[in-house]
């Protein structure tokens, strides 16, 4: 049914879906705080621009009795139930900030006439790519794939002189929501990653992973996995690892590696960690005080969603344009706006661009060091440490195929 949008006459509302099933197990109170902090900033920015309007958020909670698993994999119907609730109440904002689970976002996008923008903190899966009115404020799987292919092909860096074309992917099904979809994208036979690699095998059992570490007949020296160092240790322990094994640990939303007092444990010496360049101003923020480093990005995405709406609202109001039009719904892409922690860039499909950072463990200092950075916006790698103190022979990354050492 046609739902009227509370989005005119100087009063603009944001519908925030507060779902029990969420990409990160974050107390809804923390997300409310993030949204409210964002609203304060937006009101100030609009006031500064001479726009005397009201901006509010309505928090829509799902029925916890029905949807209480907290697990994204059972989230498909929750988003639709919330939309039904909005429909019954005949109360929809100018924008929907909500579902973070790939399943619920995909289903909501499929089953509704989206004449309003949808902003998601999550929705990492490939099935949420290229959606015309969906904006994603946390790095989706597509961006990870493009980095990996770029890095695999790189062969003209002093510390990486071989192109790689093979990989193992460890995926045991217990991953967090972000990791689940990142690895799902790497596993998919029709994905860009699979298309560009000559050999790729998914390891699903702990023992498979453990056996590969010293298997002389392995088909690749490179293993991709997703999670934190503790996750790797649970799996790998102190087992011996062949000297030309490279483990790529995808841990995007974790800035603990950049903390001053962090020392890399010995089991990380064969590991390259892929993470995001850390923010700086969040540490003292009122909404982030209670957040762990891994949760900051999630709350920040909610906050930035509010700021993005404020940015677009300001532009449309200044141009005298209507907010409840398809033009507004399709405008949340191919732009840069002032986020909470600095400029945020969205690509042509409304997905956030970021700087990914590849870290290695220095054998000298036992510290995590930046090896290179990757700008997802231009799909380009920038070497940082030109003299890495690697564990690998000659301080160069080995070939991905067993039996051929660094040249």
């Amino acid at each position: 049914s046609q739902v009227s949008q509370n989005c005119h006459n100087g009063s603009y509302e944001i519908s925030v879906l507060m779902m029990g099933n969420s990409a990160f197990a974050e107390p809804l109170k923390n997300l409310e705080d993030a949204v409210n902090e964002g609203l304060e900033i937006v009101r100030g920015r609009l006031q500064n621009a001479g726009l005397n309007v009201t901006v509010n958020a309505t928090f829509m909670y799902s029925d916890g009795l029905i949807h209480n698993s907290g697990d994204c994999r059972s989230s498909t119907c929750e988003g639709l139930d919330l939309l039904r609730k909005i429909s019954n109440a005949q109360r929809m904002g100018c924008v929907l900030i909500g579902p973070s689970c790939t399943y619920s976002t995909f289903q909501m996008y499929l089953d509704t006439e989206l004449s309003y923008p949808m902003i998601s903190a999550g929705s990492f899966g490939l099935s949420c790519d290229y959606k015309e009115t969906l904006t994603r404020l946390m790095s989706p799987a597509r961006k990870l794939m493009y980095f990996l292919v770029n890095f695999w092909k790189t062969n003209d860096l002093p510390f990486k002189t071989y192109s790689w074309s093979t990989s193992y992917v460890y995926k045991n099904g217990t991953e967090t929501e972000d990791c689940f979809w990142y690895l799902n994208a790497l596993e998919a036979s029709v994905s860009y990653f699979s298309h560009e690699l000559g050999f790729k095998v998914v390891l699903r059992q702990d023992k498979e992973f453990q056996d590969i570490l010293m298997d002389h007949n392995r088909k690749s020296n490179v293993i991709i996995m997703c999670g934190g160092p503790e996750f790797l240790y649970k799996l790998k322990g102190d087992r011996a690892v062949a000297e030309d094994i490279v483990i790529i640990l995808v841990d995007l939303f974790n800035d603990q590696y950049f903390e001053d007092n962090v020392t890399a444990p010995d089991y990380m010496k064969n590991v390259l960690v892929l993470t995001l360049s850390p923010g700086n101003s969040l540490l003292n923020s009122s909404f982030s005080r209670n957040l762990s480093p891994t949760k900051r990005d999630f709350a920040l995405a909610y906050l930035n969603g509010i700021l993005l709406f404020g940015h677009m609202l300001k532009i449309f109001l200044e141009n005298g344009e209507n907010i409840t039009t398809p033009k507004f719904a399709h405008a949340f892409r191919n732009l840069t706006f002032e986020g909470y922690d600095g400029p945020v860039t969205l690509d042509d499909w409304g997905d956030v661009d970021s700087t990914m950072v590849l870290l290695y463990t220095s054998v000298d200092t036992k510290k995590y060091k930046v090896l290179l950075t990757y700008d997802t916006h231009v799909n380009k790698t920038y070497p940082v440490d030109m003299s890495p103190t690697f564990t690998w022979k000659n301080s160069k990354l080995p070939n991905d195929i067993t039996g051929r050492g660094p040249q």
Epitope: N155, D156, L157, P158, F159, T161, S362, D364, T365, Y382, P383, V384, D385, M386, S387, P388, T389, N394, S395, K396
Partner: antibody, heavy 119, light 107 residues
Framework: QVQLVESGGGVVQPGRSLRLSCAAS????????VHWVRQAPGKGLEWVAV???????DYNAAFISRFTISRDNSKNTLYLQMNSLRAEDTAVYYC?????????????WGQGTLVTVSS | DIQMTQSPSSLSASVGDRVTITCRAS??????LNWYQQKPGKAPKLLIY???RLQSGVPSRFSGSGSGTDFTFTISSLQPEDIATYYC?????????FGQGTKVEIK
């Protein structure tokens, strides 16, 4: 003997372009990364760009939009294409070959070529 | 980007004196620190690489030490031919960067 010889410097008007060359001899040019380093009159040394043996190019961010480094291994020559030149680009431009990985020192330098940007 | 700060910017010493120049990096560069000598109108010449390794053909009166962020370059007994400007350079991360130079003169 092992040497690098720059050429192509001279006086050029602001906004114009210039291409510098650096001829290498006495060593296997294609095996080495080679750099451009510049020095404004009375000032210190400033790293401009490198082209690695594999062909990858990296720049000082200050020059990435206006300068392009390239090489022709068949001619044992390094180039620096400089566009939209400004008065502050006035400097002696040196090409230099670096040492072996992972020691990025400049072991071999050319004699330099002076570029003067003036109207 | 890593900033390299040299001190002093100039010094005057007598022949036979021990001369010390310091170089500080804005972040840890391990031992990837090199020293050059440049005489007026000439190209720089490599003296020391990787903090303390003497380049072939360079007199043993030149030496270097340090690690991490703080480095020292020493001429144990200054000679007239050592009159020049000396530069440190980090070779750890791109963009490679130089100190602003120390001009050494004879009293």
């Amino acid at each position: 003997q092992v040497q690098l010889v720059e050429s192509g410097g001279g006086v050029v008007q602001p906004g114009r372009s210039l291409r510098l060359s650096c001829a290498a001899s006495g060593f296997t040019f294609s095996n080495y990364g080679v750099h451009w380093v510049r020095q404004a009159p009375g000032k210190g040394l400033e790293w401009v760009a490198v082209i690695w043996s594999g062909g990858r190019k990296d720049y000082n961010a200050a020059f990435i939009s206006r300068f392009t480094i390239s090489r022709d291994n068949s001619k044992n020559t390094l180039y620096l294409q400089m566009n939209s030149l400004r008065a502050e680009d006035t400097a002696v431009y040196y090409c230099a070959r670096h040492g072996t990985y992972p020691y990025w020192y400049f072991a071999l330098w050319g004699q330099g070529t002076l570029v003067t940007v003036s109207s | 980007d890593i900033q390299m700060t040299q001190s002093p910017s100039s010094l005057s010493a007598s022949v036979g004196d021990r001369v010390t120049i310091t170089c500080r990096a804005s972040q840890d560069i391990s031992n990837y620190l090199n020293w050059y000598q440049q005489k007026p109108g000439k190209a720089p010449k490599l003296l020391i690489y990787y903090t303390s390794r003497l380049q072939s053909g360079v007199p043993s009166r030149f030496s270097g030490s340090g690690s991490g962020t703080d480095f020292t370059f020493t001429i144990s007994s200054l000679q007239p031919e050592d009159i020049a400007t000396y530069y440190c350079q980090q070779g750890k991360t791109l963009p490679f960067s130089f100190g602003q130079g120390t001009k050494v003169e004879i009293k």
